[in-house]
């Protein structure tokens, strides 16, 4: 029951996280004009990964896409790549985890297969979350670096060279959405990995091994895991998991765990 809950919760948390990563990637407010000592501005600039926007006091908002690919900063391209990789991995992870959910029965799928799928999706969610966090952090670092470099700059306009103070940009809402979403995806992935441990029957690792000593009929069973696994000399023929899960190893190994000596 706890395994199902952990897996289900992991899935839901990851789903919210990936939705957040997608939202953050699409949002225009990755960086917003720093208003410092001027909270009300007639022209407000903000930028996303795909376009930059200007909102006037009049209420008119104009957005322009970055129609160049080569002309964009390498860091911005890197952030785009990280976010897209995060979304793709997350989406595949979601797809895999749907089939891995213990509460969903698909044909005669073994619990061992579900455990493997849960682990796979968990790892995908972790990598997806890390990609998003990395992408947002790289962008944030870029903003911090540029913030103090935004001194007087020269622009060539219709009237020739004109002295103008460059607009300073600070953290936009998308950064916080990205950080939170990446964190949620990461947490969801960890939960899926934890759920996987519960789904995979551990007894494969602790199979009884028969040693036939000469002249004696004695069975030796290693008891080194007694404290951690609950295995003892009296646990013979007793199932550890109610789900009756069997790993592929177990199916293939000739003497099963119910091997009487």
């Amino acid at each position: 029951m706890a395994v199902t809950a952990c897996q289900g919760l992991g899935f839901v948390v990851s789903l919210i996280g990936i939705a957040g990563i997608i939202a953050a990637t699409c949002m225009d407010q990755w960086s917003t004009q720093d208003l410092y000592n001027n909270p009300v501005t007639a022209v407000f600039n903000y930028q996303g990964l795909w376009r930059s926007c200007v909102r006037e006091s009049s209420g008119f908002t104009e957005c322009r896409g970055y129609f160049t690919l080569l002309g964009l900063p390498a860091m911005l391209q890197a952030v785009r790549a990280l976010m897209i990789v995060g979304i793709v991995l997350g989406a595949i992870g979601l797809l895999v985890s749907i089939f891995a959910l213990k509460c969903i029965r698909i044909g005669s799928m073994e619990d061992s297969a579900k455990a493997n799928m849960t682990l796979t999706s968990g790892i995908m969610f972790i990598v997806s979350g890390l990609c998003a966090i990395a992408g947002v952090s790289v962008f944030a670092n870029m903003l911090v670096t540029n913030f103090w470099m935004s001194t007087a700059n020269m622009y060539t306009g219709m009237g020739g060279m004109v002295q103008t103070v460059q607009t300073r940009y600070t953290f936009g809402a998308a950064l916080f959405v990205g950080w939170v979403a990446g964190g949620l995806t990461l947490i969801g992935g960890v939960m899926m990995c934890i759920a996987c441990r519960g789904l995979a029957p551990e007894e494969t690792n602790y199979k009884a091994v028969s040693y036939h000593a000469s002249g004696h009929s004695v069975a030796y069973k290693p008891g080194g895991f007694k404290a951690s696994t609950g295995f003892g000399s009296n646990t013979k023929n007793k199932k550890i998991y109610d789900g009756g899960a069997r790993t592929e190893d177990e199916v293939q190994s000739y003497p099963s765990k119910h091997d009487y000596v």
């Epitope: 001027n38 007639a42 022209v43 600039n45 926007c53 008119f60 219709m158 103008t164 607009t167």
Partner: antibody, heavy 118, light 113 residues
């Protein structure tokens, strides 16, 4: 086509409060734009006073901020200007206007002349 | 506050001739976000409210004759009337539309020579 019409007393005594109202017709004051007050002293240039949004948020010219209050009444499709402690320097034609693209003013009222005199 | 300085204070031009009015701002009105200059031009005739002619320094308002054109960037701007008509006699104002408080130039009175 949006139309604006200012109304209010044409004569105000010094130290009193000037009160003007702008009635918007041909459009809703709740349309999302900012509604402005601008004045023009006789024979002089234009001076921006401030604006209000239908939500009640305001922004005033720092030179007048301590004396200005702009309010809105969405039910009557009106917004108002109150200027306290007036002096002869506040004698002007007061215009209400609506902002548009480029933070420009394509819509203006006809203006109302306010004279500050005892 | 951004100070807007217009020149000349008054201008007399013959009908059909070119009229040029200059406006200088104390700070740049150029916005790098959309590559636009936030300068507006108005025409005001006696007893009337100002009429919007040009916004974003060079975008003509609908219904404004094409003899009116705006140019310039950053801090220096120009309003040009290519062929002066009798109805163009008025006072012309430039406006800082880039930052609060919005400020206007002192005006240029255009007359017929």
């Amino acid at each position: 086509q949006v139309q604006l019409q200012e109304s209010g007393p044409g004569l105000v005594k010094p130290s009193q409060t000037l009160s003007l109202t702008c009635t918007v017709s041909g459009g809703s004051i709740s349309s999302g734009y900012n509604w402005h007050w601008i004045r023009q002293p006789p024979g002089k240039g234009l001076e921006w006073i401030g604006y209000i949004h239908y939500t009640g948020s305001t922004n005033y010219n720092p030179a007048l901020r301590s004396r200005v209050t702009i309010s809105v009444d969405t039910s009557k499709n009106q917004f108002s200007l109150k200027l306290s402690s007036v002096t002869a320097a506040d004698t002007a034609v007061y215009y209400c206007a609506r902002i548009y693209n480029g933070n420009s003013f394509p819509y203006w009222g006809q203006g109302t002349t306010v004279t500050v005199s005892s | 506050d951004i100070v807007m300085t217009q020149s000349p204070d008054s201008l007399a031009v013959s009908l059909g001739e070119r009229a040029t009015i200059n406006c200088k701002s104390s700070q740049s009105l150029f916005n790098s976000g959309n590559q636009k200059n936030y300068l507006t031009w108005y025409q005001q005739k006696p007893g009337q409210p100002p009429k919007l002619l040009i916004y974003w320094a060079s975008t003509r308002e609908s219904g404004v004759p094409d003899r009116f054109s705006g140019s310039g960037s950053g801090t220096d701007f120009t309003l040009t009337i290519s062929s002066l008509q009798a109805e163009d006699v008025a006072v012309y104002y430039c406006q800082n539309a880039y930052s609060f408080p919005y400020t206007f130039g002192g005006g240029t009175k255009l007359e017929i020579k």
